[in-house]
């Protein structure tokens, strides 16, 4: 019988509040054997896929999605989902990315590195994703 797939987790490095023009990396985690990780933006209509998967621990794999230079348009809700044959997982909770004007001061506090919890993470709608893996990469509008 098919195994129950654990929900993926999502976090952001260095945090969820990012100065304009800085970089951010979303980190999705799931079990070993994930073939495709997908980062979804706001809704399922905009997403990026990767098959560049590596070990996060003996029992976990992870994928990273990097935005080199954050723009105001990158602000919003993000979540992860993964494909482990023969099916897709549920979505992770939402993570909200906030983009702030660069203050230029070195003392302006950002969200803690690796933060994925707290008020910026929202529950997903837990609806199931039935569409097939995007084996040819982007099948929708680019995230970034």
């Amino acid at each position: 019988q098919e195994e129950d797939l654990p929900r993926p987790s999502i976090s952001a490095e260095p945090g969820t509040v990012i100065p304009l023009g800085s970089h951010v990396t979303f980190v999705c985690r799931g079990p070993v054997g994930v073939q495709t990780f997908r980062l979804e933006r706001d809704s399922r209509s905009t997403y990026n896929d990767t098959e560049d998967v590596s070990q996060a621990s003996p029992s976990e794999s992870e994928a990273r999605f990097r935005i080199d230079s954050v723009r105001e348009g990158n602000a919003g809700l993000y979540r992860c989902i993964y494909y482990k044959p023969p099916k897709w997982s549920e979505q992770s909770d939402y993570l909200e990315l906030l983009v702030k004007e660069s203050s230029g001061g070195p003392d302006s506090p950002d969200t803690e590195p690796g933060s994925s919890a707290g008020p910026t993470q929202r529950p997903s709608d837990n609806s199931h994703n039935e569409h097939a893996p995007a084996s040819q990469g982007l099948k929708a509008e680019h995230l970034y």
Epitope: T25, P31, V32, G33, V34, Q35, D49, T50, E51, D52, V53, S54, Q55, S57, P58, S59, S61, A63, R64, F65, R66, K84, S135, Q136, G137, L138
Partner: antibody, heavy 119, light 107 residues
Framework: EVQLVETGGGLVQPKGSLKLSCAAS????????MNWVRQAPGKGLEWVAR??????????FYADSVKDRFTISRDDSQSMLYLQMNNLKTDDTAMYYC??????????WGQGTPVTVSA | DIQMTQSPASQSASLGESVTITCLAS??????LGWYRQKPGKSPQLLIY???SLADGVPSRFSGSGSGTKFSFKISSLQAEDFVIYYC?????????FGSGTKLEIK
């Protein structure tokens, strides 16, 4: 259909150089980590090098036996993988395979290109 | 580096029999283990990934089990094309190491 076609192998003298190429098709090259694996005549498999995607800053990893002599690189715009091999030794004689990662595992292999290092 | 100890180095069996190959990792690798087969003069082929998952298009007579440091690979009801060389590989940390191989021979 996934295809990985290696070229560039041949006969080279010790301390010489060679550049292997791998043309990829049938999949979205830029979302996959890629590897080179080699197999000496009559021997087992030896992982040589790995390169990750732009999301992972094109990070590279090497076997100790080739570190500082071999360089793995990729051209996502052309769906090409490369292995620049310098200061070659007789121990580097092997069949060299281009390998596509999937789920972190070696899911697709090219047919290989032979490299012979001999005086 | 993680060493992968594969056994036996060779094994004889008859058509229709079952065989089991073992791979031991020198440190825990969770389920970051793959099994490959290589036919003479051909490229290796992934059979099992994540220790237990069957790769695309691979017949169900192949199976994998184990986690941590001890792994097994089983072929039930051997067919003529199964008498080739099999390798395990850990993908937990670089260098990504292979076992030394098991040659399956027809009895």
């Amino acid at each position: 259909e996934v295809q990985l076609v290696e070229t560039g192998g041949g006969l080279v003298q010790p301390k010489g150089s060679l550049k292997l190429s791998c043309a990829a098709s049938g999949f979205t090259f830029n979302i996959n980590a890629m590897n080179w694996v080699r197999q000496a005549p009559g021997k087992g498999l030896e992982w040589v090098a790995r390169i990750r995607t732009k999301n992972n800053n094109y990070a590279t990893f090497y076997a100790d036996s080739v570190k500082d002599r071999f360089t793995i690189s990729r051209d996502d715009s052309q769906s090409m993988l490369y292995l620049q091999m310098n200061n070659l030794k007789t121990d580097d004689t092997a069949m060299y395979y281009c390998v596509r990662d999937r789920a972190g595992f070696f899911a697709y292999w090219g047919q290989g290109t032979p490299v012979t290092v001999s005086a | 580096d993680i060493q992968m100890t594969q056994s036996p180095a060779s094994q004889s069996a008859s058509l229709g029999e079952s065989v089991t190959i073992t791979c031991l990792a020198s440190q825990t690798i969770g389920t970051w283990l793959g099994w490959y087969r290589q036919k003479p003069g051909k490229s290796p082929q992934l059979l099992i990934y994540a220790a237990t998952s069957l790769a695309d298009g691979v017949p169900s007579r192949f199976s994998g089990s184990g986690s941590g440091t001890k792994f097994s690979f089983k072929i039930s009801s051997l067919q003529a094309e199964d008498f080739v060389i099999y390798y395990c590989q850990q993908l937990y940390s670089t260098p990504l190491t292979f076992g030394s191989g098991t040659k399956l021979e027809i009895k």
